[in-house]
Interface confidence: low
């Protein structure tokens, strides 16, 4: 988790002088509780936006937006703590909006936004906005949380972001797999425009079962430049096992930008259809 281009982040708006600060996610008001604390944020919204860095890279960011409740507690509102928790790693990153002037009621509802948390493809986050100061131990909670799921690199807009392109999202291998005679599979795919090696991972399964009955790995050496974007054809020999008929072919590239952590592509060959044997017609109606 990180912030996009930690340049001058602004939270000021007409009628409010505000600064954005790094936060340890442990606001001082936890340790020194105040008697009067503001109410919670209203209508917290998190959306996927895209932002360029100063270097021109494109990243997905969480666009966080919320409004204030129209009650007198805004007189005691000193700021807000924004927290983003990545659910699969428990990594948390926080920033603090510090209000440098008192808030006043005005004709429009106060609205705040922040779009600098960089998020990763295919990850889920919990976004929390805490109004400051935080409540006393038995006080009413004054925060709002929402979960936010970022699409993976298959998503059209995500595909062209820097993290997705770095993991090989622009490569479309267009895999085809056909079953040949004598227990063989012919795998064909389009090479990318990089002189790097590939691995074909074959896993076979019995019909309707998920434990494998055969596994095989095939190494494809790095193509020469004249072979870029050409089709590579590989014939794999299967084990002659009755019923080991469903085959998953996975192609793992080793691009320089993602090494052994590049996006993999796969194709599956189903078991051949069994010829229908006519069933005897029962002379009673089954009860299931």
């Amino acid at each position: 988790l990180r912030l996009l281009d930690h340049r001058a982040l602004v939270c000021s708006q007409p009628g409010l002088n505000c600064t954005v600060k790094n936060s340890t996610c442990l606001d001082d008001s936890w340790i020194h509780p105040r008697n009067l604390t503001p109410s919670s944020p209203k209508d917290l919204q998190i959306q996927l936006h895209f932002a360029h860095t100063q270097q021109g890279d494109l990243f997905p960011v969480a666009h966080i937006e919320w409004t204030l409740q129209t009650d007198a507690s805004i007189l005691y509102l000193e700021g807000a703590e924004l927290s983003v928790l990545q659910l699969n790693t428990n990594e948390r990153l926080c920033v603090r909006f510090e209000f440098l002037s008192k808030l006043r009621h005005h004709h429009r509802r106060w609205r705040f936004t922040f779009s600098h948390f960089v998020v990763d493809p295919d990850q889920e986050y919990e976004v929390t906005v805490h109004h400051l100061p935080k409540p006393i131990p038995d006080g009413d909670p004054n925060h709002q949380s929402k979960n936010f799921l970022v699409p993976d690199c298959e998503h059209a807009r995500m595909k062209v972001t820097t993290p997705c392109m770095s993991s090989g999202s622009l490569w479309d291998p267009n895999i085809t797999v056909e079953t040949l005679e004598a227990h063989q599979l012919r795998v064909s795919f389009t090479l990318w425009n990089e002189s790097t090696h590939y691995q074909i991972l074959l896993t076979s399964f019995p019909h309707m079962e998920n434990h494998s009955c055969f596994e095989h790995m095939h190494h494809i050496p790095a193509p020469r430049p004249e072979e870029f974007h050409q089709r590579s054809n590989v014939t794999l020999t299967l084990r002659n096992l009755k019923g080991c008929c469903r085959h998953q072919v996975q192609i793992q590239p080793f691009f320089s930008s993602c090494l052994n952590d590049c996006l993999r592509h796969s194709a599956t060959v189903s078991c051949p259809e069994m010829p229908d044997t006519p069933e005897p017609i029962p002379d009673y109606m089954p009860l299931w």
């Epitope: 998190i46 699409p151 059209a156």
Partner: nanobody, 123 residues
């Protein structure tokens, strides 16, 4: 322009099923999460269900979990809501809504809404 058109509503008896459809036009349907939101007569808006851009992630309100199924067909630019075991409290105007690109959007942030289709559950 961006448009969402719902269909499939009607009068149905409690315990029966109904499928709502929503057809989208004017935007790249497969880029966005989609949602169903309902409004009972005289009541406020209630989020019902949402589905991510590729259909891999779905979410439901507790009140419909296990009874309703949301799905989408990106090729047909269509969103569906299969409603089983309908109850009288499911009576509402059902709206299809375009969400954000990530899931987790609040109904207030839905940028486009349909006109709604009325579902009445009564014996």
């Amino acid at each position: 322009q961006v448009q969402l058109v719902e269909s499939g509503g009607g009068l149905v008896q409690p315990g029966r099923s109904l499928t709502l459809s929503c057809t989208a036009s004017g935007f790249t349907f497969h880029d966005y999460a989609m949602h169903w939101v309902r409004q009972p007569p005289g009541g406020g808006l209630e989020w019902v269900a949402g589905v991510s851009w590729n259909g891999n992630n779905v979410g439901y309100a507790d009140s419909v979990k296990g009874r309703f199924t949301i799905s989408r067909d990106n090729a047909k630019k269509s969103l569906y809501l299969q409603m089983n075991s309908l109850r009288s409290e499911d009576t509402a105007l059902y709206y299809c809504a375009k969400g954000g690109m990530g899931s987790g959007s609040h109904p207030d942030s839905f940028s486009t809404w349909g006109q709604g289709t009325m579902v009445t559950v009564s014996s």
